[in-house]
Interface confidence: low
């Protein structure tokens, strides 16, 4: 579904078309998609509205390690990268651009998962790696959210919503010593309730981009810079979920 | 600069039809929802239209409905008001407004908007 | 087209604080819809002062804030000033999508 051809995946991160990334992609500004509007206050001006997280915990509440959910995979069922010597420095720091193997690709079994859902990136994110979701969207959606996480830090959070005062956006954030940052907003929105989707996720030096269903959405500039710390992808809302994956190309 | 200019704004008489323009600068105009709003002279503010950056979501005011189109064009950073069937209560100045990507009801952006009067 | 309902007219003095209130209903303003409020000086465009309840654009004087309750609004403007004074304007999507204004206030400042 995916049609990456991975044989020849690239070493460098200047490529503006890498690799199994959407052939439509130009070479975007950084933090293009981004509100490019009024810097809104630090305080969190998304802060559930009623109804916002039904039945679950906020982004970033997820409890526990991977597998605290019921009924999701125990620990240990996500094939990991090859144990060899150097695969990842023992620091969680790449050495290098092919730290992480270019072979794969990682993460979470086939088949339908458990949402909330925890995908564990091992020795954090680099440039060149690129995690893909696929799922549907449950009828009637109200939202979707993807939180990069380094600790109890949102280092990337990812919120598509469906009925925000009647309007359908993606809130892009990050959630710093419990406070949320500046939003960037998206008005442009790809996601349809009942229908599948493939979100992917690229992770270049100083941004993630972010395609869906194979067009370029938007790019979110870093603002964690410790990337190799950001060890855990939740993926949470109103969507039945295929599988997360990783690999690097 | 963020900018909306707008134009088109003129005498008509009851019942004939005009449309406005709005030009954009300064933004990433298709991601934005642009609404008009209007003012009568003397009175207050009042919501007319919205339109969504795909064009996908449109909404108007009831007082207008049937009467009023709302349109962009991406391509051209431009957003009009298409307006038929006018009338007297009609006049007024027209605003081209930006919502804020946040879209909890701030509306960020602001022309000096265009003059249109109804009158035999 | 149901209007937010706002007082014609406040005034206070140099310093002083007042208040605005916007009443709605549980369709607009008391229906998790968020409220903005607008600033417009005599023969100028409106200018956003507060967004999503309480929340200023950069830019703007924390002198203003924003507060909501149940079904009614309010804005507080704190040590007031000259160049204060000029209409005001609360705002709220609807359940049916649509935007509403208020009336609109009058702040005089004495």
């Known amino acids: 579904a995916d049609n990456f051809s991975l044989h020849d995946a690239l070493s460098g991160s200047g490529n503006p078309n890498p690799q199994g990334w959407p052939g439509a992609w130009g070479n975007q500004p950084a933090g293009a998609g981004g509100y490019p509007g009024a810097s809104y206050p630090g305080a969190y001006p998304g802060q559930a509205p009623p109804g916002a997280y039904p039945g679950q915990a906020p982004p970033g509440a997820y409890p526990g390690a991977p597998g605290a959910y019921p009924g999701a995979p125990a620990p240990g069922v996500y094939p990991g990268p090859p144990s060899g010597p150097g695969a990842y420095p023992s620091s969680g720091q790449p050495s290098a651009t092919g730290a992480y193997p270019a072979t794969g690709p990682y993460g979470a079994p086939a088949g339908p998962l458990i949402v909330p859902y925890n995908l564990p990136l091992p020795g954090g994110v680099v440039p060149r790696m690129l995690i893909t979701i696929l799922g549907t969207v449950k009828p009637n959606a109200n939202r979707i959210a993807l939180d990069f996480q380094r600790g109890n830090d949102v280092a990337f959070h990812f919120n598509p919503r469906f009925n925000e005062n009647n309007r359908r956006v993606i809130v892009c954030n990050t959630k710093l010593d419990n406070n949320w940052g500046r939003e960037e907003r998206q008005s442009v929105f790809p996601f349809e309730s009942g229908k599948p989707f493939k979100i992917q996720v690229l992770v270049e030096p100083d941004h993630f981009k972010v395609a869906v269903n194979d067009a370029h959405l938007l790019q979110y500039n870093h603002r964690v810079k410790k990337l190799n710390e950001i060890s855990k992808l939740g993926i949470s809302g109103d969507i039945d979920l295929t599988s997360a994956s990783y690999t690097m190309i | 600069e963020v900018q909306l200019v707008e134009s088109g704004g003129s005498l008509v008489k009851p019942g004939g039809s005009l449309r406005l323009s709005c030009a954009a600068s300064g933004f990433t105009f298709s991601n934005d929802d642009m609404n008009w709003v209007r003012q009568a002279p003397g009175k207050g503010l009042e919501w007319i239209s919205s339109?969504?950056?795909?064009?996908?979501?449109?909404y108007y005011a009831d007082f207008v409905k049937g009467r009023f189109t709302i349109s962009r064009d991406n391509a051209k950073n431009s957003l009009y008001l298409q307006m038929n069937s006018l009338r007297a209560e009609d006049t007024a100045v027209y605003y081209c407004?930006?919502?804020?990507?946040?879209?909890?009801?701030?509306?960020?952006?602001w022309g000096r908007g265009t003059l249109v009067t109804v009158s035999s | 087209q149901s209007v937010l309902t706002q007082p014609a007219s406040v005034s206070g003095s140099p310093g002083q604080s007042i208040t605005i209130s916007c009443a709605g209903t549980?369709?607009?303003?008391?229906?998790?819809?968020?409220v903005a409020w607008y600033q417009q000086h005599p023969g100028k465009a409106p200018k956003l002062m507060i967004y999503?309840?309480?929340y200023r654009p950069s830019g703007v004087s924390n002198r203003f804030s924003g507060s909501k309750s149940g079904n009614t609004a309010s804005l507080t403007i704190s040590g007031l000033q000259a160049e204060d004074e000029a209409d005001y304007y609360c705002?709220?999507?609807?359940?049916?999508?649509?935007?509403?204004f208020g009336g609109g206030t009058k702040l005089e400042i004495k």
């Open positions: 999503s309840d309480s």
């Open positions: 407004v930006r919502s804020s990507g946040y879209s909890g009801g701030g509306m960020d952006v």
């Open positions: 339109i969504d950056g795909s064009s996908r979501s449109i």
């Open positions: 705002s709220s999507y609807t359940s049916n999508s649509a935007r509403v």
């Open positions: 549980s369709s607009d303003v008391g229906g998790s819809y968020n």
